[in-house]
C-alpha cells in the first residue's frame, strides 16, 4: 500500500512540475515523497503546509494537493490549511532545499513513519 502511495505521489509531482513549469534546473525545491506524505514542488521562500496523513489512506491520483503554499503575497483562502491548525506540518523551501518538517511528524501527528508491521 505504501509503495502505491509513493507511486501516486510521484505522479502528482510530475503533473505539478508540468503545471508550474518546473524542470531539473529550476531553482526551488523539488516535490518529494518523504516516506510519510507527499510534498509538492515549491519556489524558494515558500512554505508548504500538509495535514497529517491518514495512515492507510490510498492516494487518489486525480485528487488536488492536500497542501497549501504560503508565499510572500499568497496566504491562501479561508478554507486553506493554516499554521494555527493542529495536525499541520510545514516545510520551508530555502536556497539550500527543504527545511526539516515543523512540527516533526511525531509531535504533530502522533507517528513518525509508516509501520512495516500492522
Amino acid at each position: 500500500i505504501f509503495k502505491k502511495e509513493q507511486a501516486m505521489c510521484l505522479e502528482k509531482i510530475q503533473r505539478a512540475n508540468e503545471l508550474m513549469g518546473f524542470n531539473d534546473s529550476s531553482p526551488g525545491c523539488p516535490g518529494m515523497w518523504d516516506n510519510i506524505t507527499c510534498w509538492k514542488p515549491a519556489h524558494v521562500g515558500e512554505m508548504v503546509l500538509v495535514s497529517c496523513p491518514e495512515l492507510f489512506r490510498i492516494f487518489n491520483p486525480d485528487q488536488v494537493w492536500e497542501t497549501e503554499t504560503i508565499g510572500e503575497s499568497d496566504f491562501g483562502d479561508s478554507n486553506s490549511l493554516d499554521l494555527s491548525d493542529m495536525g499541520v506540518v510545514s516545510r520551508n523551501c530555502t536556497e539550500d532545499g527543504w527545511s526539516e518538517p515543523f512540527p516533526h511528524y511525531f509531535d504533530a501527528c502522533g507517528f513518525d513513519e509508516y509501520e512495516s508491521e500492522t
Epitope: 493542529m86 495536525g87 499541520v88 504533530a108 507517528f111 513518525d112 509501520e115 512495516s116
Partner: antibody, heavy 123, light 107 residues
Framework: QVQLQQSGPGLVKPSQTLSLTCAIS??????????WNWIRQSPSRGLEWLGR?????????HYAVSVKSRITINPDTSKSQFSLQLNSVTPEDTAVYYC?????????????WGQGTLVTVSS | DIQMTQSPSSLSASVGDRITITCRAS??????LNWYQQKPGKAPKLLIY???NLQSGIPSRFSGSGSGTDFTLTINSLQPEDFATYFC?????????FGPGTKVDIK
Amino acid sequence: QVQLQQSGPGLVKPSQTLSLTCAISGDSVSNRLATWNWIRQSPSRGLEWLGRTYYRGKWKNHYAVSVKSRITINPDTSKSQFSLQLNSVTPEDTAVYYCARGTWNQDWFLDHWGQGTLVTVSS
Amino acid sequence: DIQMTQSPSSLSASVGDRITITCRASQYIVRYLNWYQQKPGKAPKLLIYASYNLQSGIPSRFSGSGSGTDFTLTINSLQPEDFATYFCQQAIMAPYTFGPGTKVDIK
C-alpha cells in the same frame, strides 16, 4: 488502571552511573500508542524532560540534548518495564526522577506518572 | 529549546475565588500546550491537554485556553484541594519543556 512503580538507589557517587527502573502495570511497554518517558525535577532546573522510548514496529528513542551523551533508556518487554541509565553523574544531577507514560490525543501528554525517586549524587 | 514562562510565580487566594495563571512560550506552539498540578511530595497530575481539553476525571472548574504563544489556566471557585503548584508544558517539539510553576496558596 495504569500504574508505574519506580525502583533504584537513592544515592549515587559522582562519576558513577545512575540506574532506575519503571515497572508498568495495566499497560504494555510495547503499546504502539504510548511513549515511556523519564523526567526529573530539582529546585535549580525545575521539571526537565530527559527522554523517551517507544515501539512502532521497532524500538526508538528521543533524548534531550542536555543529557544526550550520557543517557540510555531501554525497554524490557519480558518484564514490561523500562529503565534509565545516566552516566558520569555530578551533583547537578541530584533530583527527583519520575517515569511517565506519554499518550497521544491532539498532542503528546504525560497522563500517568511514577511515584518519583529522589536521587542524590554525593560522595 | 523552547522556553516557557509563567506568571505569577505565586499567588494567594481564598476558597471560592476564580484564579487565572498565564503561560507564555518563546516561540509559536499552536495549541500544543499541557497543564499539570503538583502537590508536595507527589508526582505532577495532568489537568489539561492540547490547550483546552480537560483530562478525564478532572473537575470542570478547571479550564484552559490560548494558542500561539499565550495560554491561560483558569480555576473557577477554588476548592481546598486546589492549593498546589501548576506547571505548563509545551508538546510541539522535543525536548518537551515545562514552565517554572505557579504556586497557589491559601490567603
